[in-house]
């Protein structure tokens, strides 16, 4: 996302269509308080950032309120009055949805339905990953609403689950960010567990009749 202008690298993250974070890495200005100036309308004057991020005592980014889904962010990073990086970007390219909230599990025999609160905007994928200690890799299933049913589970095994939200690539482009994962929750026989054993426990011997 960054640019080669005077060695300034930038990163933009649009958190949940609400807040934009622009961070910069400028080796040439590593001990300088660069200032961030922005506008959402190309006709307006630039405003200066009022919520800077600091790294080692120097400005390294800015957080902006931006609850305007379709808009463009025009910005300029300056050393005094001298612009060192100027750009304008469609903010939705850098969308990062918020982490799933109110995650719930509903068990029925060998299947579980994972639900959570849908976000207020669309064109998202809700991904559930799960594994048991017997699995070498996470399994994954995703739907376009937060209502994901996973079938074919073994009721005797302990499964770990976590959930995240991703922006659909066909809509938002390929350079968005997935949400942070929800907390891992562990389940066995339809009941929540503190954790799943790292090493699989051997199956119980069957009692002969």
């Amino acid at each position: 996302q960054g640019g080669a202008a005077e060695g300034v690298q930038i990163q933009i993250i649009y958190f949940n269509l609400e807040t934009v974070q622009v961070t910069w890495n400028a080796s040439k200005y590593s001990r300088t308080n660069l200032t961030f100036h922005y506008r959402f309308n190309g006709d307006e004057a630039y405003d200066q950032c009022t919520n800077y991020l600091l790294q080692e005592g120097h400005t390294s980014g800015c957080l902006l309120d931006a609850e305007q889904r379709d808009d463009i962010l025009y910005f300029s990073i300056r050393n005094g009055t001298h612009p060192v990086f100027t750009a304008s970007r469609w903010m939705v390219y850098y969308l990062k949805p918020s982490s799933p909230k109110h995650v719930r599990f509903s068990w029925h025999q060998d299947a579980v339905t994972v639900t959570c609160s849908d976000l207020s905007y669309g064109d998202l994928l809700y991904e559930v990953q799960y594994r048991s200690p017997f699995d070498t890799e996470w399994q994954s299933k995703q739907e376009n609403t937060c209502n994901v049913t996973i079938e074919g589970l073994d009721a005797e095994k302990c499964y770990s689950f976590w959930v995240r939200v991703k922006a659909m690539e066909d809509v938002y482009g390929p350079d968005t960010y997935p949400s942070d994962w929800s907390e891992v929750t562990c389940w066995q026989r339809g009941e929540i567990r503190d954790a799943c054993a790292e090493t699989p426990t051997p199956p119980k011997p069957k009692l002969s009749k």
Partner: antibody
């Protein structure tokens, strides 16, 4: 399959105005998620994006042209329009209308009209 | 605005050979780079979206790669109908901008 047909091009005097039309068929211009754009191509073959109008009627314009152009649409006629004022010789170009990929204003353009030539000369 | 620079301006290649066209962005654009083909008297046609994603109906000999500021369009085995002008376009920057084009001609 969307088809786009531009019209309204021709010879215009410097300082004059033009209104180009783009008739869409096979697809509604109000379909959610799609944006419609005007792009022009100069005689030297360079391409310039001029502006968008969205399914929601929201418009965006190239800052270099913003003071001189207006993009509008007529849903009943399933058509888009480009109004351009204060024309100069350097506005001589082939003018295309095009549709963005689903997902909106921000992407590539997957359907184009055949273009209409505008010549600005006295 | 983001400046797109294509090279070379003209590329001469024999039919059946491989062609490699380059596009450079003045700022990093991730993978939001698109390629078009234009033949004389026709409108541009979208070939590749988002640097490497294929478009329905476009022959498999067309492929794209790259991210950040450096991008490449490769035509694996040139057919007679591939001789045309090719443009790249970036989309995350506002306004969207195109390269000046590479003319692919028969050697």
């Amino acid at each position: 399959q969307v088809q786009l047909v531009e019209s309204g091009g021709g010879l215009v005097k410097p300082g004059g105005s033009l209104r180009l039309s783009c008739a869409a068929s096979g697809f509604s211009i109000t379909t959610s998620g799609y944006y419609w754009t005007w792009i022009r191509q100069f005689p030297g073959k360079g391409l310039e994006w001029m502006g968008y109008i969205g399914y929601n009627s929201k418009t965006y314009y190239n800052p270099a042209l913003k003071s001189r152009i207006t993009i509008s649409r007529d849903n009943a006629k399933n058509s888009l329009y480009l109004q351009m004022n204060s024309l100069r010789a350097e506005d001589t170009a082939v003018y295309y209308c095009a549709r963005s990929l689903y997902g909106g204003y921000k992407d590539a353009f997957d359907s184009w009209g055949q273009g209409t030539l505008v010549t600005v000369s006295s | 605005e983001i400046v797109m620079t294509q090279s070379p301006a003209t590329l001469s290649v024999s039919p059946g050979e491989r062609a490699t066209l380059s596009c450079r962005a003045s700022q990093s654009i991730g993978t939001s780079l698109h390629w078009y083909q234009q033949k004389p008297g026709q409108a541009p046609r979208l070939l590749i979206k988002f640097a490497s994603r294929s478009i329905t109906g476009i022959p498999a000999r067309f492929s794209g790669s790259g991210s950040g500021t450096e991008f490449t369009l490769t035509i694996s085995s040139l057919q007679s109908e591939d001789f045309a002008v090719y443009y790249c376009q970036q989309s995350p920057g506002f306004p969207p901008t195109f390269g000046q084009g590479t003319k692919l001609e028969i050697k």
